[in-house]
């Protein structure tokens, strides 16, 4: 059986949209599928790689690579989006391309970044882990680490940094899919809101879905012990 809830939820573009949340109900009146997975049910994506889920993650990364920071012109906030989800009238889409990006390395002004910008994350202002020396962040935002410490200045002078962030990665459904959403939308979809991250590529949703012991490699499911747990 399915339980359908519909609600008007604020989406990334800044417009309210009627959204459906479909919950698979337990036929025997018991825990939901997500709870059963957390309790150690035999769920193959937690035991070994699932091709469908792998393709979903790759597709999400491809989209994220092309994203930019959508900054509302009225200073009400910013959110990482695709160009199509950033209003041409009410917002500014900050996306590095051609010569608009910062240099890859402070000491070499030649090669410029083309992947980015990312709301509230920039290799020029992150102090931990710093983008320098042998640890320069790649020109692919899906390979950026989580910045745990920003430079101590209140204002950076960068549009995508000096804005109030409105969306973060949200892990939705048992398939471990991720979307950058408002907290409101994430809660409605019964997702897990990652307050610490700026990009979906920085979180491992399947690890969150599976629970129990974290995967040794967050990209590779290894909970074969589920075969004995259930």
């Amino acid at each position: 059986a399915q339980h359908v809830t519909t609600q008007l939820v604020l989406r990334n573009k800044g417009v309210y949209e009627s959204v459906k949340y479909i919950q698979q109900e337990n036929f025997w009146i018991g825990p939901s599928s997500i709870d059963l997975i957390h309790l150690g049910a035999k769920f193959s994506p937690c035991i070994r790689k699932d091709q469908q889920i792998e393709q979903l993650v790759l597709r999400e990364r491809d989209l994220e690579r092309d994203s930019g920071c959508c900054v509302q012109n009225d200073h009400s906030g910013c959110i990482q989006t695709q160009r199509k989800d950033c209003s041409e009238t009410l917002a500014t889409f900050v996306k590095w391309q051609d010569d608009t990006g910062p240099p890859m390395d402070k000491s070499d002004l030649g090669q410029k970044r083309t992947s980015g910008a990312v709301c509230h994350q920039d290799p020029r202002t992150c102090e931990e882990p710093a983008s320098s020396g042998a640890h320069i962040w790649p020109d692919d935002i899906t390979k950026w680490p989580i910045c745990t410490e920003q430079a101590k200045s209140n204002r950076t002078g960068f549009l995508h940094m000096d804005c109030q962030i409105k969306g973060r990665p949200c892990c939705i459904s048992t398939k471990g899919s991720c979307e950058i959403t408002t907290r409101e939308y994430c809660e409605f979809m019964h997702g897990y809101f990652h307050e610490e991250a700026t990009l979906c590529s920085q979180v491992h949703c399947l690890d969150k879905v599976c629970g129990l012991l974290p995967f040794l490699n967050p990209e590779v499911p290894d909970q074969f012990y589920r075969l004995w747990l259930s």
Epitope: L8, V15, Y16, S18, D74, R83, K84, S87, E88, T89
Partner: antibody
């Protein structure tokens, strides 16, 4: 400058379908939402839906979901709207308009007359 | 869907006067209301969005105000070219909806 050139007036029979076009120029067609708006005399404006030519994503007004089909051809920078099972209620001027939340650029409209 | 009630539907005034057109939403739409001008043989023109933000190139005599459910378009010192049809549109939620229009004519 941005221009939206709409196809000419159509006279169609009840029950038939009609496909009208909107050719865009002066901007990157793939990067902006295209909307369709209906105007009947004395009835004001009604938003039908919008399409993002870059990936074909669409949003529809529920009222027109089974009536209108929005498509876009990136190679010719043209947006299309097909209206099916036409009745006299569908006689109207149909506008294409660029924008996501508000409509900055409009076409001049296409008059569709449904008559036996 | 959000219903938008626009008033008056018809207005006849003289050039140089100041007029106001009102739009009322059936529910709270925050500040997200736009105003358009329609003239025969010309493409529709966006005047104001987000309640009070003027679209670039729009003369300063056009101004918008309001939030929540009540909004106003004010045109001060009417010029001959301002006599036209005006519509409001909410852009707070899907589906976008329009007011019924106000016809502004020369007295």
């Amino acid at each position: 400058q941005v221009q939206l050139q709409q196809s000419g007036a159509e006279l169609v029979k009840p029950g038939a379908s009609v496909k009208i076009s909107c050719k865009a120029s002066g901007y990157t067609f793939s990067n902006y939402w295209m909307n369709w708006v209906k105007q009947r005399p004395g009835k004001g404006l009604e938003w039908i839906g919008q399409i993002y030519p870059g990936d074909g994503d669409t949003k529809y007004n529920g009222k027109f979901k089974n009536k209108a089909t929005l498509t876009a051809d990136k190679s010719s920078s043209t947006a299309y709207m097909q209206f099916s099972s036409l009745t006299s209620e569908d006689s109207a001027v149909y506008f294409c308009a660029r924008g996501d939340l508000v409509f900055v650029y409009w076409g001049l409209g296409t008059l569709v007359t449904v008559s036996a | 869907d959000v219903q938008i009630t626009q008033s008056p539907s018809y207005l006849a005034v003289s050039p140089g006067e100041t007029i106001t057109i009102n739009c009322r939403a059936s529910k709270n739409i925050r500040k997200y209301l736009a105003w358009y001008q329609e003239k025969p043989g010309k493409t529709n023109k966006l005047l104001i969005y987000s309640g009070s933000t003027s679209q670039s190139g729009v003369p300063s005599r056009f101004s918008g105000s309001g939030s929540g459910t009540d909004f106003t378009l004010t045109i001060s010192s009417l010029e001959p070219e301002d006599f036209a049809m005006y519509y409001c549109q909410q852009h707070n939620e899907y589906p976008y909806t329009f007011g019924g229009g106000t016809k502004l004519e020369i007295k």
